[in-house]
């Protein structure tokens, strides 16, 4: 099939790399600069990513494949093969509409990137709270009050009040 | 299809701060640059500056001290303030919107109608 | 003084070819794709060729665009009466990091 294919069509014939040039009777011409082919049998060249302004270049463009961006310092990519660029913010923090904003009490975010998460509520898998959470880290559950034996651990359970780490309801 | 419009006062005092803002309509402000181009009377195209939806800057080296360019996603609006400015500042002020260096190749390709701002006491 | 260099003025009549050159560095037009604009007095620049060679959606065949090392020139052929306008070339340039631009030519169509 392919041996009948590029008798019928001799630009199956160009490699990755070059284009059917139908101006010049359908031979194989090397893309230009800034362009690329990455299959074979192509009658145009894609023009190159540049990788410009906020975004760098990871990987330079050549004629058979498309140049790779990735992000300045402080910010990373987002998006398919890092389409976008979004500022990077604090542990302990998230990016909203008017920029970095701290997570709000019961909420934390160990990334510079992505939204805060409400602390895991440890009661609902029937432990306790053994690090408090903060902006920045998730509460460490513990074993449950009753599975602690007389002298076995010196945590204290925490007051049946509030139980710090308990995300707000 | 996105548009863009340049708003501010046309006359500014010497010395003092230029301020204008592009609203952009028809489109989104996210994942692209938004640039400020100006044009002396008769004279070349100058690019002030631009900032990425998600806030990098960058300015021409001739202009850094005195130029801040903001953004403000949540209106789709960007900004631009140019200080301490002189006659020579006296231009007509393009905002743009500018697609090149994400998977765009086309560069600067919407432009506003532009705004003339005097510079003159 | 601009970064990239375009003569002033360039005229043709109706019918001929014209070509209008623009001339820049290593650093911008010799490392990066360059684009063109053409602008009517009192209205903004608009895209005419972009990454060297490629037209924008409803921008006719007879203008095209090229570039050899640090040099990039574009070419109207046809020429009619309303291609009269300021055409402008710009390039990205990296060690501004940013767009630098010509400063124009002046297409008179005689």
């Known amino acids: 099939f392919e041996r009948t294919r590029s008798l019928q069509d001799p630009c199956s014939n160009c490699p990755a790399g070059t284009f059917c040039d139908n101006n010049r009777n359908q031979i194989c011409s090397p893309c230009p600069p800034n362009s690329f082919s990455s299959a074979g049998g192509q009658r145009t060249c894609d023009i190159c990513r540049q990788c410009k302004g906020v975004f760098r270049t990871r990987k330079e463009c050549s004629s058979t494949s498309n140049a790779e961006c990735d992000c300045t310092p402080g910010f990373h990519c987002l998006g398919a093969g890092c389409s976008m660029c979004e500022q990077d913010c604090k542990q302990g923090q998230e990016l909203t509409k008017k920029g970095c904003k701290d997570c709000c009490f019961g909420t934390f975010n160990d990334q510079k990137r992505g939204i805060c998460r409400p602390w895991t509520n440890c009661s609902l898998d029937g432990k306790s709270v053994l690090v408090n959470g903060t902006k920045e880290r998730d509460v460490v559950c513990g074993p449950s009050p009753a599975d602690l034996s007389p002298g076995a651990s010196s945590v204290t359970p925490p007051a049946p009040a509030r139980e710090p780490g308990h995300s707000p309801q | 299809q996105v548009q863009l419009q340049e708003s501010g006062p046309g006359l500014v005092k010497p010395s003092e701060t230029l301020s204008l803002t592009c609203t952009v309509s028809?489109?989104?402000?996210?994942?692209?640059?938004w640039t400020w181009i100006r044009q002396p009377p008769g004279k070349c195209l100058e690019l002030v500056g631009y900032?990425?939806?998600?806030?990098?800057?960058s300015y021409n080296p001739s202009l850094k001290s005195r130029v801040t360019i903001s953004i403000d996603t949540s209106k789709n609006q960007f900004s631009l303030q140019l200080n301490s400015v002189t006659a020579a500042d006296t231009a007509v002020y393009f905002c743009?919107?500018?697609?090149?260096?994400?998977?765009?190749?086309?560069?600067?390709?919407?432009w506003g109608q532009g705004t003339t701002v005097t510079v003159s006491s | 003084q601009s970064v990239l260099t375009q003569p002033p003025s360039a005229s043709g009549t109706p019918g001929q070819r014209v070509t209008i050159s623009c001339s820049g560095s290593?650093?911008?037009?010799?490392?990066?794709?360059v684009n063109w604009y053409r602008q009517l007095p009192g209205t903004a620049p608009k895209l005419l060729i972009y990454?060297?060679?490629q037209r924008p959606s409803g921008v006719p065949d007879r203008f095209s665009g090229s570039k050899s090392g640090t040099s990039a020139s574009l070419a109207i052929s046809g020429l009619q009466s309303e291609d009269e306008a300021d055409y402008y070339c710009?390039?990205?340039?990296?060690?501004?990091?940013?767009?630098?631009f010509g400063c124009g030519t002046k297409l008179t169509v005689l």
């Open positions: 743009a919107r500018d697609d090149y260096g994400g998977n765009g190749y086309y560069g600067v390709d919407v």
């Open positions: 028809g489109g989104s402000i996210s994942s692209y640059y």
């Open positions: 900032i990425y939806y998600s806030g990098y800057t």
């Open positions: 290593s650093s911008n037009i010799g490392n990066n794709p």
């Open positions: 990454s060297n060679n």
């Open positions: 710009a390039a990205w340039d990296d060690s501004l990091n940013g767009w630098v």
